[in-house]
């Protein structure tokens, strides 16, 4: 199968700003290649075929360029519609792969996060397992590690994360980290902390609680 | 205003089968190709599976090879999906699209919102 890289994997940039994603084929694909924006909860909306043929509808700002293995989409002037997903796919061969996508989001101002902890509720407790939530609020850039704790131990590959969409209005992001046990493996130990690592903070950031002293 | 709705997904047991539809409405789908594509969490979306126009057959990825079959219905403006021996790396979204010609252009100017597949082992 062709494969199909784009970057870079986010862009921060500000209305009026001049934009420009790349996508490299790992073999040539001549002109056949498409660009798509996509929103949060919306289908892909087709911008551009056989590299630089614009879309009935799409705005003059968007230029697609290239052939070959090597293609370009700019945005001339940045609007703030046009925060989004863009995704490149090529259509020279049948698997028709996609980019993995690059997202230009709204160049914010760095900000830390707060931090808060939250143990397992005793309603959760009793159906046999335990999860306590990181909760990491109003954060920018949206790179941010959080590592769990437990009794001092480091805890990996028994968590999830999930991060919001940007805020319109400030442009920061949360983000919740969940630590999952069984009932009986919580019950085992006593200091459950996670460890927050932000550009914003100037070190790490711990919170953490006792069990059964909540 | 073309619309594409996909419906048939859910949750499914490894082994087992389920059957996706795709209804369009806007457009007459019989001089168009159709394409199912499915999207797993961080992973690209990937292409499944293409019913061209009638009488011109289809073309399946390497993973829906032999176990996914495509149709379409043309009075009724619907293609579908069948897929067999499900397994858990067939988890994702499954999406239609159109394509954005009558050509077999291989680009989509019209997507579905998805529909979820979750098979478990």
């Known amino acids: 199968d062709i494969q199909m890289t784009q970057s870079p994997s986010t862009l921060s940039a500000s209305v009026g700003d001049r934009v420009t994603i790349t996508c490299r084929a790992s073999q040539s694909i001549n002109t056949w290649l498409a660009w798509y924006q996509q929103k949060p909860g919306k289908a892909p909306k087709l911008l551009m075929y056989k590299a630089s043929s614009l879309e009935s509808g799409v705005p003059s700002r968007f230029i697609g360029s290239g052939s070959g293995t090597e293609f370009t989409l700019t945005i001339s002037s940045l609007q703030p519609d046009d925060f989004a997903t863009y995704y490149c796919q090529q259509y020279n061969s049948d698997s028709k792969m996609f980019g993995q996508g690059t997202k230009v989001e709204v160049k914010g101002t760095v900000a830390a996060p707060s931090v808060f902890i939250f143990p397992p509720s005793d309603e959760q407790l009793k159906s046999g397992t335990a999860s306590v939530v990181c909760l990491l609020n109003n954060f920018y850039p949206r790179e941010a590690k959080v590592q769990w704790k437990v009794d001092n131990a480091l805890q990996s590959g028994n968590s999830q994360e999930s991060v919001t969409e940007q805020d319109s209005k400030d442009s920061t992001y949360s983000l919740s980290s969940t630590l999952t046990l069984s009932k009986a493996d919580y019950e085992k130990h006593k200091v459950y902390a996670c460890e927050v690592t932000h550009q914003g903070l100037s070190s790490p950031v711990t919170k953490s609680f006792n069990r059964g002293e909540c | 205003q073309v619309q594409l709705q996909e419906s048939g997904g859910g949750l499914v047991q490894a082994g087992g089968s389920l059957r996706l539809s795709c209804a369009a409405s806007?457009?007459?789908?019989?001089?168009?190709?159709l394409s199912w594509f499915r999207q797993a969490p961080g992973k690209e979306r990937e292409f499944v599976a293409v019913?061209?126009?009638?009488?011109?057959?289809?073309f399946y990825s390497d993973s829906a090879q032999g176990r996914f079959t495509v149709s379409r219905d043309d009075a009724k403006n619907t293609v579908y999906l069948q897929m067999n021996s499900l397994k858990p790396d067939d988890t994702a979204v499954y999406y239609c699209?159109?394509?954005?010609?009558?050509?077999?252009?291989?680009?989509?100017?019209?997507w579905g919102q998805g529909t979820q597949v979750t098979v478990s082992s």
């Open positions: 699209a159109i394509d954005s010609d009558t050509f077999y252009s291989g680009s989509y100017d019209y």
């Open positions: 806007g457009r007459t789908i019989s001089r168009y190709a």
């Open positions: 019913a061209r126009r009638s009488g011109d057959g289809a």
